[in-house]
């Protein structure tokens, strides 16, 4: 999921209680599958860096090995490096596992920016800082890789969370997700919240500070506040859901609902920016441009290549709109709106001429595959990724980073109608023409 | 330290078409933009226009629009520049050059050049 | 699209003395504005940036200034491996990034 990136991904990442947490607010929420309240032992279990991904340590093999593997809710194959690599510290060894059985079957995965290849065998795979089971999973050994593993970004891995439909080499090879349902009393659901730090961070500051939390089967009240308004799950392959309507600042964007979700929209943790179809993305700058027009930007920074800076704690956050999107809701002619700020899209880095000011780049790109509600979508949410129902909820999230101004929303009931008609339909081809590409 | 190394001289007929290549050595396109620039012999320096690899589509100057396309192979950090339709006054030095990383949108590198003349 | 316009369009200078290069913006750049040295048959190279910052390893002696429309690249004492024609560039409006049409700095 790449900068465009789709994976591996670019992400703006870091640290939970590095942003503002908002005050707690009670709720009465409908009953969920899957445990509810509090999961301690999950909470806090992702780590991650500016544009590299946010990533959750795993065992796999008897005994042991642990991994770092980073979550990704835009592919379907768990995948670890299995053979020496200048870009990793570790990698699973085959060999040394007493649990692990070959199924004599390749894997080739392409992407946009790269590749990787490996061989397909089941060994024992657990999450320390997850549910207390092991699980017998799928693991494609990677053996050959380019420009896949990131130096630095200190993951050795891949955990595909979507569903087999979009599993390589096809979708006979059972998800992770999947078998840990199958094959233990975990509920068919988990949940994310990404935390973007607001600032870049250096490798010692990732490895300090928090990334946010995956809980595996239920819900943390603690990482969300208000209420959880859920979208209907589309169909079952990436997490695709149907955009209804975009607002910049609560300007209607007024383009046909069809071009929101053009080819489809998902939801992939393995993608940084906000990735947006070329006609809403042109409409999107203007509509940004327009309403930061105080100041000036080189048009570079609109598309991606140059980096905003202002001199360190003088971001004029307020100059900038609120970006709105509104998801088909649950019930009949009901949508919510989600609503991130300035703080999700603008993604902090450094300016590698100069590290004295606040430096950004604009996290919003063009996509040829649909929307893609990356890691700048995600930073301001808790997203629940309810499976069991069809469906993926969202909050605003106790840990995204926001100001004294404004703070990101999830809101609704809003009445929209004819939503089905914002869905586009894909003509049915050659399903191995599926986007692997990502930013 | 990145290196942009082009491809060779050419020699085409006017109305043909020419593809320049530029390869990223010892580094990545990713995350940077590459333009294209060319000088005609005694001339000063045109933009034709850039890619952004990953990003999506190339930017072109207007007078570029239409006879060049520039796309890039991210798997080989390769970009390439292809003008069509050639005529004796496309007969000029074609530069790759890298920017990005930065607010500034300098291009702080760039490749060795590559002659392309056109003659009948 | 902004148009750069240097002056002088050739600027005959001696060893060890100053030279001082003009480039003038149509409109505002905000200090999104380099300056390229070229010599025969070699490829640009980079020397300022952001206006004002010297590339790396690019010695002391030049130095640029200026912002918005109006811009100056100063070389205090001029080098035998100076001699060179000296282009601006604006990347703030853009496409297309627009070239100065370069100052030729010559041995007087």
């Known amino acids: 999921t790449q900068h465009g990136i789709r994976l591996p991904l670019r992400s703006g990442l870091g640290g939970a209680p590095l942003g503002l947490r908002l005050p707690r607010e009670t709720d009465e929420e409908p009953e969920e599958p899957g445990r509810r309240g509090s999961f301690v032992e999950m909470v806090d279990n992702l780590r991650g860096k500016s544009g590299q991904g946010y990533y959750v340590e795993m065992t796999v093999g008897s005994p042991p090995q642990t991994l770092n593997i980073l979550v990704d809710t835009g592919s379907s194959n768990f995948a670890v490096g299995a053979a020496p690599h200048p870009f990793l510290h570790r990698y699973y060894q085959r060999q040394l596992s007493s649990t692990y059985r070959d199924l004599r079957k390749g894997v080739y995965v392409p992407y946009t920016q790269g590749k990787w290849e490996g061989e397909l065998g089941t060994d024992l795979v657990s999450i320390p800082h997850g549910p207390n089971v092991t699980v017998r999973a799928n693991i494609a050994a990677i053996t050959e890789s380019d420009k896949f593993f990131i130096n630095g970004s200190n993951w050795e891995g891949i955990l595909g969370l979507a569903y087999a439909e979009i599993a390589r080499p096809d979708d006979s090879l059972e998800p992770f997700f999947d078998s840990l349902v199958k094959q233990t009393h975990v509920p068919n659901l988990f949940s994310l919240q990404l935390c973007g730090a607001g600032f870049p961070l250096n490798q010692s500051e990732v490895l300090a500070s928090v990334g946010g939390s995956m809980i595996i089967g239920g819900i943390d009240h603690s990482l969300y506040t208000g209420s959880l308004w859920y979208t209907p799950i589309r169909r079952e392959w990436y997490y695709e859901v149907i955009i209804v309507r975009v607002e910049i600042n609560g300007q209607d964007l007024k383009m046909d609902c069809k071009e929101y979700n053009y080819d489809k929209s998902i939801v992939d943790s393995g993608t940084t920016n906000l990735r947006l179809p070329k006609k809403v993305f042109e409409a999107a700058v203007k509509s940004i441009k327009a309403a930061s027009s105080t100041e000036k930007f080189p048009d570079g920074f609109w598309l991606g290549e140059q980096l905003v800076c202002w001199q360190a704690g003088t971001t004029p956050w307020n100059i900038f709109p609120v970006i709105s999107l509104y998801l088909m809701g649950e019930v009949t002619n009901q949508s919510f709106r989600i609503t991130i700020l300035p703080q999700q899209y603008l993604r902090p880095v450094e300016d590698v001429a100069t590290s004295q000011d606040d430096c950004y780049k604009f996290a919003i790109s063009q996509s040829s595959t649909g929307t893609v509600m990356g890691a700048v979508i995600m930073e301001g949410f808790y997203v629940v990724f309810d499976r069991a129902r069809k469906r993926i909820g969202f909050a605003v999230s106790a840990c995204h980073v926001h100001d004294e101004f404004r703070t990101a929303a999830v809101e609704g009931p809003f009445v929209t109608l004819d939503m089905e008609d914002c869905g586009y339909n894909i003509p049915q081809t050659d399903e191995s023409t599926l986007m692997t590409g990502r930013a | 330290q990145v290196q942009l190394v082009q491809s060779g001289a050419e020699v085409k007929k006017p109305g043909s078409s020419v593809k320049v290549s530029c390869k990223a050595s010892?580094?990545?396109?990713?995350?940077?933009?590459i333009s294209w620039v060319r000088q005609a012999p005694g001339q000063g320096l045109e933009w034709m226009g850039n890619?952004?690899?990953?990003?999506?589509?190339?930017n072109y100057a207007q007078k570029s629009q239409g006879r060049v396309t520039i796309t890039a192979d991210e798997s080989t950090s390769t970009a390439y520049m292809e003008l069509s339709s050639l005529r004796s006054e496309d007969t000029a030095v074609y530069y790759c050059?890298?920017?990005?990383?930065?607010?500034?949108?300098?291009?702080?590198?760039w490749g060795q050049g590559t002659m392309v003349t056109v003659s009948s | 699209e902004i148009v750069l316009t240097q002056s002088p369009a050739t600027l005959s200078v001696s060893p060890g003395e100053r030279a001082t290069l003009s480039c003038r913006a149509s409109?505002?750049?905000?200090?999104?504005l380099a300056w390229y040295q070229q010599k025969p048959g070699q490829a640009p190279r980079l020397l300022i940036y952001?206006?004002?910052t010297r590339a790396t390893g690019i010695p002391a002696r030049f130095s640029g200034s200026g912002s918005g429309t109006e811009f100056t690249l100063t070389i205090s004492s001029l080098q035998s491996e100076d001699f060179a024609v000296y282009y601006c560039?604006?990347?703030?409006?853009?496409?297309?990034?627009?070239f100065g049409g370069g100052t030729k700095v010559e041995i007087k």
């Open positions: 050059a890298r920017s990005g990383g930065t607010r500034y949108g300098m291009l702080d590198v």
């Open positions: 010892g580094g990545t396109l990713s995350g940077y933009a």
């Open positions: 890619i952004i690899p990953g990003f999506g589509t190339a």
């Open positions: 409109q505002s750049v905000g200090s999104n």
């Open positions: 952001g206006a004002s």
């Open positions: 560039q604006q990347s703030f409006v853009w496409p297309p990034r627009t």
